[in-house]
Interface confidence: low
């Protein structure tokens, strides 16, 4: 009779992560008597999958019965698979010896190549805001996936980037792979409502690539442009001074008026108007009586935005005669009335 | 609904190529092993080609092996079989089949596609 | 390469009737047999895979038993939609192979 043969009919299994895999293998014959092993690897360091004839494998069902004597069978099935499971799966036949079974023959052996999807990408910014004309960077991690080819993309608001760096680790064989990239993206003071997209397609993802999303009003800082006017009101002797704080963003804001130096008032922005593309608009205005100044006032708006270093726009009012209109409060964003006459 | 349906046969000299496509719908085709079997007019079915989920292993007839080329492209849900040195002896109906169970081998087939004919004659 | 044999040929049957065909594999395939439904002009379809196991929404009539190299597939009451040629396939070595397959025909 002719010589049994262990065989091992497919090359390589390809299992997606939490699936269950089919090892296959049969035997042509029945003889010699003793028990199939399945191992993970080759040489003295492989890792015992299955015994047939003892132990517990929680994991492994068998194909077929083999407790049936005519059983030729030997296929498993090995449950839950993980990434860590990855690796050549050998169909080994044994022959009943005393004390121990004898190794006989060994199948070819069955690449399992397991298939895990990336984790969603999570995109994260600069630590600090940056204003328009800045290029600042984001990173994209994903990890987990496998095998290791793996594709990343990063948009602006719809548009390709092209100016970023990805790396897969390890460089080596894995049972799974991390993809870390860095995008430059230069910022415009149109950006509060921009976002930054990192696009990860892997083969285990069937065309619906994973996508990670930063904002950029979280990013970007626009500073404020400061306008001051006057125009008379109400009696000859009363003159309102507006100081108008156009586009900035974020919110945070605090508006100091000066007269001749000295702080006359501080506020906060609260009341303001939003414009189109996200920044926002902000007016305060003083109400000066003139009469009771004999010289010129010098009136300052001091604006702190966000922490950052003051930016201050001054106004000379003019006390040496009755005051005229001095350009117009073209601010239709006119958001609370706060008066204060200087004595 | 699942779909297969098979394109690109026809009548065709001996020596000649063809090139017959199998576009897959309402499933997750990359999911799947994939076959092509075929059925001469009158006889019976002989399987042909079988290609993995990722295309990494590729199993062919000896009948057609070093002649025809099974491939696939799971971004467009497309398995192809690129016939060369096409003989008389080919000509057949041609199905493309599906298998059964996900990320196992090509073993057994369901569904199959409706059939394209080949006809090769001088 | 394994070789299947179906028989019979061909078989002659009332509606009603049990019917079973036989498949004998050239060597030991263990449990990796199908079994394939055909009617005329159309595609193949999957009546039992695992030599015993039943395709979803195929009729429970249909049963599949054998293992290792004889195989027999039963229609336990034909009916008239049941007319049509049956192939067997064993699916664990490569190359695949059918057997030339059993007629099943009115009498």
């Known amino acids: 009779e002719e010589e049994l043969q262990v065989i091992q009919p497919d090359k390589s299994v390809l299992v997606a992560a939490g699936e269950t895999a089919t090892l296959r293998c049969t035997a042509t014959s029945l003889i010699p008597v003793g028990p199939i092993q399945w191992f993970r690897g080759a040489g003295p360091g492989r890792e015992l999958i299955y015994n047939q004839k003892e132990g517990h494998f929680p994991r492994v069902t068998t194909v077929s019965d083999l407790t049936k004597r005519n059983n030729m069978d030997f296929s498993i099935r090995i449950g839950n698979i993980t990434p860590a499971d990855a690796g050549t799966y050998y169909c080994v036949k044994f022959r009943k010896g005393s004390p121990d079974d004898v190794e006989f023959k060994s199948g070819a052996g069955t690449e399992l190549s397991v298939r895990a999807k990336p984790s969603a990408p999570v995109v994260s910014g600069p630590a600090a805001r940056a204003t328009p004309q800045h290029t600042v960077s984001f990173t994209c991690e994903s990890h987990g996936f496998s095998p290791r080819d793996i594709t990343l993309k990063w948009f602006k608001n719809g548009n390709e980037l092209s100016d970023f760096q990805t790396n897969v680790d390890p460089v080596g064989e894995s049972v799974s792979y991390s993809i870390h990239s860095t995008a430059k993206v230069v910022l415009t003071r149109e950006d509060v409502h921009s976002q930054v997209i990192c696009e990860v397609a892997h083969v285990t993802l069937q065309g619906d690539p994973l996508r990670g999303t930063a904002n950029l009003s979280e990013t970007i800082r626009v500073p404020p442009t400061l306008e001051v006017t006057q125009q008379p009101v109400r009696a000859e002797n009363q003159v309102n001074v507006t100081c108008q704080v156009r586009k900035f963003y974020p919110q945070r804001l605090q508006l100091t008026w000066l007269e001749n130096g000295n702080v006359s008032r501080t506020e906060t922005a609260s009341t303001v108007t939003e414009n189109k593309d996200g920044t926002y608009n902000w007016m305060s205005w003083l109400l000066v009586n003139v009469s009771a100044h004999r010289d010129d006032v010098k009136l300052t708006c001091q604006v702190e935005h966000d922490g950052q270093p003051a930016v201050s726009k001054s106004h000379d009012l003019k006390v040496s005669a009755h005051p005229k209109e001095q350009g117009s409060n073209t601010a239709a964003e006119n958001t609370g009335s706060n008066e204060r006459n200087i004595y | 609904e699942v779909q297969l349906v098979e394109s690109g046969g026809g009548v065709v000299q001996p020596g000649r190529s063809l090139r017959l496509s199998c576009a897959a719908s309402?499933?997750?085709?990359?999911?799947?092993?994939m076959a092509w079997v075929r059925q001469a007019p009158g006889k019976g079915l002989e399987w042909v080609a079988s290609?993995?989920?990722?295309?990494?292993?590729?199993y062919y007839a000896d009948s057609v092996k070093g002649r025809f080329t099974i491939s696939r492209d799971n971004s467009k849900n497309t398995l192809y079989l690129q016939m060369n040195s096409l003989r008389a002896e080919d000509t057949a109906v041609y199905y493309c089949?599906?298998?059964?169970?996900?990320?196992?081998?090509?073993?057994?087939?369901?569904?199959w596609g409706q059939g394209t004919l080949v006809t090769v004659s001088s | 390469d394994i070789q299947m044999t179906q028989s019979p040929s061909s078989v002659s049957a009332s509606v009603g009737d049990r019917v079973t065909i036989t498949c004998r594999a050239s060597?030991?395939?263990?449990?990796?047999l199908a079994w394939y439904q055909q009617k005329p002009g159309k595609a193949p379809k999957l009546l039992i895979y695992?030599?015993?196991s039943l395709q979803s929404g195929v009729p429970s009539r249909f049963s599949g038993s054998g293992s290792g190299t004889d195989f027999t597939l039963t229609i336990s009451s034909l009916q008239p939609e049941d007319f049509a040629t049956y192939y067997c396939?064993?699916?664990?070595?490569?190359?695949?192979?059918f057997g030339g397959g059993t007629k099943v025909e009115i009498k």
């Open positions: 089949a599906t298998a059964v169970e996900t990320y196992s081998g090509p073993n057994w087939f369901d569904p």
């Open positions: 309402g499933f997750t085709f990359a999911h799947y092993g």
């Open positions: 290609i993995w989920v990722d295309g990494s292993n590729k």
């Open positions: 060597q030991g395939i263990s449990s990796w």
């Open positions: 695992a030599a015993s």
């Open positions: 396939q064993q699916a664990i070595y490569f190359p695949i192979t």
